[in-house]
Structure formats: structure tokens, C-alpha cells
């Protein structure tokens, strides 16, 4: 669809005669009649194939034509067509002498013709204008015409139709020959896609509008090239979605059982130096001076009784000292300057002599000790104190300080491992002699049941098309993550292409 | 053959929720060509066109619905889906659901046949 | 909002031609289809992208725009062609209906 343009500039006709050679009375008052038609070698009367057109009367005898001319006419005439420009045609332009109002053809007299020129030839689509002048022996008509393509029309031949647009089915503007040119942020066949946040990640990101970057299920980030770990994933990262690969020092399936202890918490006290022993577990090893669980506890090396033959000990800086009594020296008071005859044994012990009267010893009777008899038997030298614990005196009493998992007086109760519920996923817990057992349900196994050994979603490999198949361990199901250029729970979809234009 | 089938209650109470369901069979509602659309035709009335939504997700409604309309699609089931709440009788319409082709300029080349819904009490 | 407007009827004689116009504001700069739809049946796309017919459509539906008004033209207008007659254009994002034109 295009239009032939017709500008007409000038004509002369300076005799004011008509083509027969008779004068106009009083001028001839000029109208011109345009035929436009395919191309003839000779041009001939006829059909005019490709319209008409007749201005109104533009002037007497002489005159120049002004664009878009006053009286109704149009200047440049238009004469439109709705088919393919072949590149050439045949133009005929008649002047005619009006000697009245009646413009029609059967109302004017067959000699008012005035002149009758006739062109043909090749003209491409364009905006440029082709100059031309025709002379008779009485006229001349200057004139100059092209031919354009019609609003939406593109090509050579004005033959392709293309209508910028803005919508969701095509954000494009017209290039010169018809083809799209996509609008910023947007592309593919019909300028219909748009085109990502740079770095989206081709797989795991898609858009609806340019710049955008929406993530598909499992991954996350302003990129969508982060996965999502395993809901309930506490101290563990992923590669791909739905992962819990544990920190160094978490284990369990959500990571969230504490492997090390002693480096979270820090719980062994004065110096002591701390051992994980298995989950929440440890064992503190206590500097010289300090005990309890948690080497919390100071110790008085006097705790232990070291003088000995009734020498009262005492509390320093760097360790104890000994004060022996009367007849006795040492570090510990174990060394005597007394003989059976000083009666050195108390609380009813029996002397006997030893190296020839030189030395001595006491045979104590039950419930007294020391080398003189002179101490109550030790309450913790029994060891009263049952799996493991610690005796220490306490001046009249003693006390227990149990191991980890005992207590009572005696440390003689067992605390049940269970109570802190440690097997997983409703495992049945067992308190034995040493420890615990779990009783894991069907679908879990490990120390706390604690490893899924149930059904893989995946192992039946649901997913098409080469896609990536997680198992979301908190249903039992199956996520498939799509290669490019599939789509669907199952990727069985593949994205169609869309066919080429039609021309 | 591509068809589409409109499924759905016939009758809804006013101020509730119409939900149909356009069921895209003999092709994949995920082709990159087509947008998926719903119009509407009142008794004796013309057509009204309500929106679309492409396989992606993106969706477009007619800006006199829009506050009330929903149009999503499962492409695992190959169906796409409207919603539109609080609705009155004059909701009342046959409601079709169509294949709008981009290299059709989008024309509505395809078409289910139809769901009377009527709205009343 | 964006307005396409129909004449309600036309009538033709059998073997004549049928014109129908949709008008709106600056039309020729967008994509027109057309739609006939047969009482009690779904609509069926007889014209797209103004002037381009789909495959199975005869050939006497023409179609044509320019300015602000599109026309469908049926030429050799026979009994089966009696339906009514949708034009549809896309306005920005949203498409948008004509009123509709009875042929009979």
C-alpha cells in the first residue's frame, strides 16, 4: 500500500490557446486531469489501472501552482494504491479548458483539451522527487512526483506491513525495509521477551519485564544463583537446592547437633583444657589445683590429708606445708625420734619395735590409721563413691562429686540418658549400663536415628528432559530443576519457538 | 488439534468468588508463541475481553476488572485459571477461555465453547 | 479507556457485498482482527493483523485500515455468512472488543 505523489509547479501556455489552436475566450481557465496505470511501451488510451485524479481549476493561461493549492485541490494530487509498487507504470496528465463550473468529462466539449503529455518508466520507492518538464509547440508543464509507501507500510514495494507496538505481543518500532527493531530491554522474534537483570543466572532466573531477575524454586539471591538449603538447616550450607551439607563442628540432618563442644562454648574453666566426647559431650582435664566437672572447683592440697603422724598441714601459694608434732620431722611428718617406750601409739594401737629399738611401728585397731593411730580411718579410702565418682572430705563428711550421667550420695543412681530425648525422628530410646540405644522407626537409622534411609523421591527419576532432581527431605517429594528450554513439574515441557514471521 | 475446555460451578452467590479452570489439551500451554486469555459475552450482550497470562506467568487484565481479577496458569497440568471476586449479576455471562497467537498480531485463533455462569442468590 | 464502535446491522442481498466498519482513535496504527460469531457457538477469527486471513477462511473476507477506521468486507455474501461480526484492536496492554454489527 503506497501513494503516487504528483506535484505540479508550473504551466505556460502564454497564446492562451487550446490543442486545436482556437484561443480560450477570455483565458483558458486551466483544470488538469491525471491518469496513473501500469506500464505500457506505448502508452494508449485505457483503463487507468492504477487511478485517477482531476484538480480544480488551478489558473488562467500561465501560471505557477502552489502547494496544497487554494479552490479545493491538492497539491501534491495523491493517487493511492493497495497493492505491491511494481517499479514502473505510465503516467498521462491532460490540461483541459473549463469554460464553465461543470468540471466532468461529459460536460465539457471534446476540443477543450488544452494539452495531453504521456510518461513511462521506472520509479523506485523513495522520498526523493524526480523532476520532469514536458513542452508542446504551444504549452509546457513543469512537474515532479515520487512514489511512498503508506503509513505502516515498509520495503521496496511498500509491500510489508508492520505497526510499531507496545503490548505484550511485541515491544518493537518499524525499521525502514519492515523489519522490528526491539525496543530497550527487550527481545526475541517479536521483540516479546525481555531481556534479564545482567548476571541473572540462565537456568535458575527468569523475568516478565526487562531488568528483572525472578528466581525459580530452590534458589534465591538478587541473581538467583544462591540454592536454598534444606528448610530447617541451621549451621549447613548448599550447592544445590535443598541441601544441609554441616559447618565443621555440626552434624544431625538440619546440622543442628553441636560436634564441638568445647570450641562453641568453652565450658572448661581455670586453664583446663577441654576433649569433645560426642554431641553436647566433653571432658575437662583439669589443671594442677582445680577440680569438678568443669575444673570450676579449687582445690586445697590439704584435702588429702598428707601429714601424717598428727602433723597439721597448711595452705600455700605454691603447695602445703606440714607442722609435725613433737618427736617427728619430714616433709610429710613421716620420719620418728621416738621409741615403744614413749608409748607413741594412740587410741589403744599396739607398739612394736623395729631395727633393734631404733624405730617403731603402731598395729592400729580398726577405725584408726596414721602411723600413731592418731587418725579416724579416712572416709574415702573405702572409695564409698560408686561409678568413677570422686571422694572428698569435707572436714567431719565427706561428698561424692559424680561423673557425668550418675548422681546420689554415692553416685550410686544412674541419670537416664534418655531424659533429654535424644533419639530422632520418634526413635525409641533404651538406658543400658553404659550409655543408651536408640530404636530408630522405619525410614531412619544411625547412633540417634538420625540418618534418612527412606524412599528417594528421585529414585524413579520423575524428571524429563535431562533435568535435576532434588528430594525435599520434609515431604518426601520431588522438586525437578528444568534446563534451559524446558518448563513443567517434570520439565516435560519444552518451551516452542515461535515460528517465523509470515512474509 | 489444539482445544480448550471451560470447567466451573454454573451458579455463584453474589459477593462470592468465580473460580473456572480452562483446560488446554493436543498442546503445550507452555509454548513461547501464544498467550492464554479469558473473555466474557453478558446475555445477549458483546464480547468482553477480561485478560491473558503467558506460560511464564505474566499477566495483563482489562483495567475495569483489574481490583477484582486473578488469572493464574499450572503448567504441570497444562490449565490456566481465572478468579474474580465480589461479584454481582452483572458477572452474569457465558465466560470462554482462548489461544491468543503473537505471529496472529495476537488473535484469539482458538476457543473453548463456553461456560454459562450465573450469578445469584 | 480505548473505544471501538460498530454499526449494529447490516443487510445485504445474497451475492452482494457486505461492508462493516469499526471505528476508533488513530485505528490504522494498530493490528485489527475480526471475529464472526453464529448464535449459540464460540467466536471464530475470520481476519488478523487488518487485512490477513487465517488458514480455512474463504476468501471472500477481506479486510482493510486505515486512518481510524478498519472495515471487513464480504464480497459474494451468502446465507452462511448471517452471524454477528466482532473488530478487536490491543490498547496498550489490555484488548479491547467493537459493540458488534448483526449481518443478516
Known amino acids: 500500500s503506497g501513494v503516487f505523489q504528483l506535484q505540479l509547479q508550473e504551466f505556460i501556455n502564454e497564446r492562451g490557446v487550446l490543442a486545436s489552436g482556437r484561443p480560450c475566450e477570455p483565458g483558458c481557465r486551466t483544470f488538469f486531469r491525471v491518469c496513473l496505470k501500469h506500464f505500457q511501451a506505448v502508452v494508449s488510451p485505457g483503463p487507468c489501472t492504477f487511478g485517477t485524479v482531476s484538480t480544480p481549476v488551478l489558473g488562467t493561461n500561465s501560471f505557477a501552482v502552489r502547494d496544497d493549492s487554494s479552490g479545493g485541490g491538492r497539491n501534491p494530487l495523491q493517487l493511492p494504491f493497495n497493492f505491491t509498487w511494481p517499479g514502473t507504470f505510465s503516467l498521462i496528465i491532460e490540461a483541459w479548458h473549463a469554460p464553465g463550473d461543470d468540471l466532468r468529462p461529459e460536460a465539457l466539449p471534446p476540443d477543450a483539451l488544452i494539452s495531453k503529455i504521456a510518461i513511462q518508466g521506472s520509479l523506485a520507492v523513495g522520498q526523493n522527487w524526480l523532476l520532469d518538464e514536458q513542452t508542446s509547440t504551444l504549452t509546457r508543464l513543469r512537474y515532479s512526483y515520487r512514489v511512498i509507501c503508506s503509513d505502516n507500510y515498509y520495503g521496496d514495494n511498500c509491500s510489508r506491513l508492520c505497526k510499531k507496538r507496545n503490548d505484550h505481543f511485541g515491544h518493537y518500532v518499524c525499521q525502514p525495509d519492515g523489519n522490528l527493531s526491539c525496543l530497550p530491554g527487550w527481545t526475541g522474534e517479536y521483540c516479546q521477551q525481555p531481556i534479564c537483570l545482567s548476571g541473572c543466572h540462565e537456568q535458575n532466573g527468569y523475568c516478565s519485564k526487562p531488568a528483572e531477575c525472578l528466581c525459580r524454586p530452590g534458589w534465591q539471591g538478587r541473581l538467583c544463583n544462591e540454592c536454598i538449603p534444606h528448610n530447617g538447616c541451621r549451621h549447613g550450607t548448599c550447592s544445590t537446592p535443598w541441601q544441609c551439607t554441616c559447618d565443621e563442628g555440626w552434624g544431625g540432618l538440619f546440622c543442628d547437633q553441636d560436634l564441638n563442644y568445647c570450641t562453641h562454648h568453652s565450658p572448661c574453666k581455670n586453664g583446663a583444657t577441654c576433649s569433645n566426647s560426642g554431641q553436647r559431650s566433653y571432658t575437662c582435664t583439669c589443671r594442677p589445683g582445680y577440680t569438678g566437672v568443669d575444673c570450676e572447683l579449687e582445690l586445697s592440697e590439704c584435702d588429702s590429708n598428707p601429714c601424717r603422724n598428727g602433723g597439721s598441714c597448711k595452705d600455700q601459694e605454691d603447695g602445703y606445708h606440714c607442722l609435725c608434732p613433737p618427736g617427728y620431722y619430714g616433709l610429710h611428718c613421716e620420719h620418728s625420734t621416738l621409741s615403744c617406750a614413749d608409748s607413741p601409739c594412740f587410741n589403744g594401737g599396739s607398739c612394736r619395735e623395729r631395727n633393734q629399738g631404733a624405730n617403731y611401728a603402731c598395729e592400729c585397731p580398726p577405725n584408726f590409721t596414721g602411723s600413731n593411730c592418731e587418725k579416724k580411718v579416712d572416709r574415702c579410702t573405702s572409695n564409698p563413691c560408686a561409678n568413677g565418682g570422686q571422694c572428698l572430705n569435707r572436714g567431719p563428711s565427706r561428698m561424692c562429686r559424680c561423673r557425668p550421667g550418675f548422681t546420689g550420695t554415692y553416685c550410686e543412681l544412674h541419670v537416664s540418658d534418655c531424659a533429654r530425648n535424644p533419639c530422632a525422628h520418634g526413635g525409641t530410646c533404651h538406658d543400658l549400663e553404659n550409655g543408651l540405644m536408640c530404636t530408630c522407626p522405619a525410614g531412619f537409622s544411625g547412633r540417634r536415628c538420625e540418618v534418612r534411609t527412606s524412599i528417594d523421591a528421585c529414585a524413579s527419576s520423575p524428571c524429563f528432559n535431562r533435568a535435576t532432581c532434588y528430594t525435599d527431605l520434609s515431604t518426601d517429594t520431588f522438586v525437578c530443576n528444568c534446563p534451559y528450554g524446558f518448563v513443567g513439574s517434570r520439565c516435560e515441557f519444552p518451551v516452542g519457538l515461535p515460528p517465523s514471521f509470515p512474509w | 488439534e489444539v482445544q480448550l475446555q471451560e470447567s466451573g460451578p454454573g451458579l455463584v452467590k453474589p459477593s462470592e468468588t468465580l473460580s473456572l479452570t480452562c483446560t488446554v489439551s493436543g498442546g503445550s500451554i507452555s509454548s513461547s508463541s501464544y498467550y492464554w486469555g479469558w473473555i466474557r459475552q453478558p446475555p445477549g450482550k458483546g464480547l468482553e475481553w477480561i485478560g491473558d497470562?503467558?506460560?511464564?506467568?505474566?499477566?495483563y487484565y482489562n483495567p475495569s476488572l483489574k481490583d477484582r481479577v486473578t488469572i493464574s496458569v499450572d503448567t504441570s497440568k497444562n490449565q490456566f485459571s481465572l478468579k474474580l471476586s465480589s461479584v454481582t449479576a452483572a458477572d452474569t455471562a457465558v465466560y470462554y477461555c482462548?489461544?491468543?497467537?503473537?505471529?496472529?498480531?495476537?488473535?484469539?485463533?482458538?476457543w473453548g465453547q463456553g461456560t454459562l455462569v450465573t450469578v445469584s442468590s | 479507556s480505548y473505544e471501538l464502535t460498530q454499526p449494529p446491522s447490516v443487510s445485504v442481498s445474497p451475492g452482494q457485498t457486505a461492508s462493516i466498519t469499526c471505528s476508533g482513535d488513530?485505528?490504522?496504527?494498530?493490528?485489527v482482527s475480526w471475529y464472526q460469531q453464529k448464535p449459540g457457538q464460540s467466536p471464530v477469527l475470520v481476519i488478523y493483523e487488518d487485512s490477513e486471513r487465517p488458514s480455512g477462511i474463504p476468501e471472500r473476507f477481506s479486510g482493510s485500515n486505515s486512518g481510524d477506521t478498519a472495515t471487513l468486507t464480504i464480497s459474494g455474501t451468502q446465507a452462511m455468512d448471517e452471524a454477528d461480526y466482532y473488530c478487536q484492536a490491543w490498547d496498550s496492554e489490555a484488548g479491547v472488543f467493537g459493540s458488534g454489527t448483526k449481518v443478516t
Open positions: 497470562i503467558y506460560y511464564a506467568g505474566s499477566t
Open positions: 488513530r485505528l490504522g496504527d494498530k493490528y
Open positions: 482462548a489461544r491468543e497467537d503473537m505471529i496472529l498480531g495476537g488473535g484469539a485463533d482458538n
